[in-house]
Interface confidence: low
């Protein structure tokens, strides 16, 4: 899916507003430090796809997040603010049923939220390389502590 | 089981305001999506908008942005649809539809019982 | 604006027979869904996503298509199947076609 024409603010309102909170439920209980952030994204468009992947994309060691709070909000957020993002999830959708068993918190669930705070905090600033922080406040990083 | 509960029946004159409400049961009513969709008579489907339960985000058919206002109370678990400054042909059925964005091809696979507006000087 | 174009609009057969409905988009799009009305009746779900049966649908109704054109075929008309049929798409406001009569010859 190409995530060019998304409402950007929209969606990143959607994060600032339940979004970001859900993901600190999530880490919750976990150190700060404990986790490096290793997945980067350089512009908004980007920084959507790689957080899609790991949101809804099953992994080694974290079979799926996609019934999480987070996730299902993302994936909320995407479908309204994303013209036609609902219909290119309807197949992986699906293969996310059948995968479904039970939500277990794995350290590796852990490690990728962790990457996941990180992708979102990006989108939020996305002009920070080349503008410096004047046109984009740090609005979330009261509320996290993860170093990026 | 899946409900949608409409409110009742309503005649307006021109220029006037209709607010119609939709009573969700059977799921978590933030979980999923709610649609608006309106049927003149003897006419297509017509979708109004469309918000999310959790955050009230919307999105609004342009035709409608303006005159429509799409709400929800969660406490209730129910939606709302506000179309203002109503003419004749606003007259119509008017359907909340839930949408739930987990089932394969996000379309509206419940739908409420319908609210008949009358917009008659 | 997707707009999409159903044909033809009323279709006259005889229970038994085989109906096949069309639904032409005004541009290319991923997925089609397909509703049934009744009279007085809040519309029902029949196909999703091109091809996926609806929970509680008979197995006489299929969908195919892509791109532009998309088609609901129902096998066998049955007595209950005589009803108004809708297209619907999502690209990024959702849009129905204007309906396809079938009514008993």
């Known amino acids: 899916y190409d995530f060019t024409n998304c409402d950007f603010e929209k969606i990143k309102a959607a994060y600032l507003s339940t979004i970001s909170k859900d993901l600190i439920t999530y880490m919750s209980g976990t150190k700060s430090t404990e986790f490096n952030n290793t997945v980067s994204c350089s512009n908004r468009p980007h920084c959507l796809t790689e957080i899609q992947s790991l949101t809804f994309n099953p992994t080694a060691g974290c079979a799926s997040l996609a019934k999480e709070m987070f996730a299902m909000k993302t994936k909320a957020a995407l479908a309204i603010w994303c013209p036609g993002y609902s219909e290119t999830q309807i197949n992986a959708t699906q293969a996310m049923k059948k995968a479904r068993k039970s939500k277990v918190t794995t350290n590796k669930c852990l490690e990728q939220v962790s990457q996941l705070q990180g992708l979102w905090r990006r989108f939020n600033r996305p002009l920070l390389k080349q503008q410096g922080s004047s046109d984009y406040k740090d609005d979330d990083d009261k509320h996290h502590h993860h170093h990026h | 089981e899946v409900q949608l509960v409409q409110s009742g029946a309503e005649v307006k004159k021109p220029g006037a305001s209709v607010k119609v409400s939709c009573k969700a049961s059977g799921y978590t009513f933030t979980d999923d999506y709610m649609n608006w969709v309106r049927q003149a008579p003897g006419q297509r489907l017509e979708w109004m908008g469309i918000?999310?339960?959790?955050?009230?985000?919307?999105s609004y058919n342009q035709k409608f942005k303006g005159r429509v206002t799409l709400t929800v109370d969660k406490s209730a678990s129910t939606a709302y649809m506000e179309l203002s400054s109503l003419r004749s042909e606003d007259t119509a059925v008017y359907y909340c539809a839930r949408e739930d964005y987990d089932y394969d091809g996000y379309a509206m696979d419940h739908w409420g019982q319908g609210t008949t507006v009358t917009v008659s000087s | 604006e997707i707009v999409l174009t159903q044909s033809p609009a009323t279709l006259s057969l005889s229970p038994g027979e085989r109906a096949t409905l069309s639904c032409r988009a005004s541009?290319?799009?991923?997925?089609m869904h397909w509703y049934q009305q009744k009279p007085g009746q809040a519309p029902r779900p029949l196909i999703y996503?091109?091809?996926n049966l609806a929970s509680g649908i008979p197995a006489r109704f299929s969908g195919s298509g892509s791109g532009t054109d998309y088609t609901l075929t129902i096998s066998r008309l049955e007595p209950e199947d005589f009803a108004v049929y809708y297209c619907q798409q999502w690209s990024s406001n959702r849009t129905f076609g204007g309906g396809t009569k079938v009514e008993i010859k």
């Open positions: 918000i999310s339960p959790y955050n009230g985000g919307t």
């Open positions: 541009s290319s799009v991923s997925y």
């Open positions: 996503a091109t091809s």
